[in-house]
């Protein structure tokens, strides 16, 4: 059976299988029966990240400081710039086009996972035996105080928002 399609890194034009341009280069002219594909490197602040037949390179992403963005990884001729958010902020989407402040975990909830430049704070309810009495983006649920180890007794039970209150043992009891 004869060949009917071009090889992996080729494209078909005018019955001719031409080599695609490699990442970091754009197409200047298609090959012909008598000439090779002509490719040129992308310019400063441009990139192409795949084998391609594009006549224009893509512009690197701009990390706008006004949107809370900063450069995490500078782009090359083969890769786009990667943006991340300033301290205290995280991306609103995977493409990180803008930033919002990290959320705090309300009283009764603790931080399960601290936020990063690309992910928000993850909160979890404080389980029995633990509490959080602050609104925080960093604090985990803390364990209730153990009155026994201090030779005290529980005077007021703890909740998910409050610690137990310890007091002296009642000496009146027999």
């Amino acid at each position: 059976e004869p060949p009917t399609a071009c090889r992996e890194k080729q494209y078909l034009i005018n019955s001719q299988c031409c080599s695609l341009c490699q990442p970091g280069q754009k197409l200047v002219s298609d090959c012909t029966e008598f000439t090779e594909t002509e490719c040129l490197p992308c310019g400063e602040s441009e990139f192409l990240d795949t084998w391609n037949r594009e006549t224009r390179c893509h512009q690197h992403k701009y990390c706008d400081p006004n949107l809370g963005l900063r450069v995490q990884q500078k782009g090359t001729s083969e890769t786009d710039t990667i943006c991340t958010c300033e301290e205290g902020l995280h991306c609103t989407s995977e493409s990180c086009e803008s930033c919002v402040p990290h959320r705090s975990c309300l009283p009764g909830f603790g931080v399960k996972q601290i936020a990063t430049g690309v992910s928000d704070t993850i909160c979890e309810p404080c389980p029995v035996g633990f509490f959080s009495n602050v609104s925080s983006a960093f604090e985990k649920c803390r364990p209730w105080t153990s009155c026994e180890t201090k030779d005290l007794v529980v005077q007021q039970a703890g909740t998910n928002k409050t610690d137990v209150v310890c007091g002296p043992q009642d000496r009146q009891r027999a």
Partner: antibody, heavy 121, light 112 residues
């Protein structure tokens, strides 16, 4: 312009191995398959196999299966042929040749200058 | 043994035309335009002269032409010149995932 420059003459003993290189320039190396063809003294052309310089995939003719290995180093645009368990009848000029395709046909448009391998005890 | 059959030798005088035949089967030469022709001078690498039966690469003289009839492809050289004296190989490309088959080669002698 497209050029395929091969390594020099080799003299080997029977049972030994030989590695011939083919350095490509003037085109996008991973974009075109590379074929290897040999020619024994006073004989015709004999196709041995091809390599896809992008993926490293290979195809060999039955006769050379298991004794020939085609490899490439895309970072230096070079294809290699390794022939082991050499015999005297492997004495030949070994050529690399670039494949060019159209919709219905492929052909070998550029050839290296050839590398003579002599197998003699 | 080659799957493509060529005459071992042909000859002609300067200025004459000669034709080299290449006979295959209905599954290669007969069915598809898969034949190419290569010229090889002694001690030199083969050079592509004709591909896809009758197409000429850039730089190849228009004295070289290709044709096909049934299961036989032919290379014709018109206005024969001394530098045309060489070995000529036909080649069938039997599909991208199969292999290349060469004819046995034809020695062209330019007389005189």
């Amino acid at each position: 312009q497209v050029q395929l420059v091969q390594s020099g003459t080799e003299v080997k003993k029977p049972g030994a191995s030989v590695k011939v290189s083919c350095k490509a320039s003037g085109y996008t190396f991973p974009g075109y398959y590379m074929h290897w063809v040999r020619q024994a003294p006073g004989q015709g052309l004999e196709w041995m196999g091809w390599i896809n310089p992008d993926s490293g995939g290979t195809k060999y003719t039955q006769k050379f299966q298991g004794r020939v290995t085609l490899t490439r180093d895309a970072s230096v645009s070079t294809a290699y042929i390794d022939l082991n368990r050499l015999r005297s009848d492997d004495t030949a000029v070994y050529y690399c040749a670039r494949e060019r395709c159209r919709t219905t046909n492929c052909y070998l448009d550029y050839w290296g200058q050839g590398s003579l391998v002599t197998v003699s005890s | 043994q080659s799957a493509l059959t060529q005459p071992a030798s042909v000859s002609g005088s300067p200025g004459q035309s000669i034709t080299i035949s290449c006979t295959g089967t209905s599954s290669d030469v007969g069915n598809y335009n898969l034949v190419s022709w290569y010229q090889q001078h002694p001690g030199k690498a083969p050079k592509l002269m004709i591909y896809e039966v009758n197409r000429r690469p850039s730089g190849v003289s228009n004295r070289f032409s290709g044709s096909k009839s049934g299961n036989t492809a032919s290379l014709t050289i018109s206005g024969l010149q001394a530098e045309d004296e060489a070995e000529y190989y036909c080649c069938s490309y039997a599909g991208r995932d199969t292999f290349v088959v060469f004819g046995g080669g034809t020695k062209l002698t330019v007389l005189g």
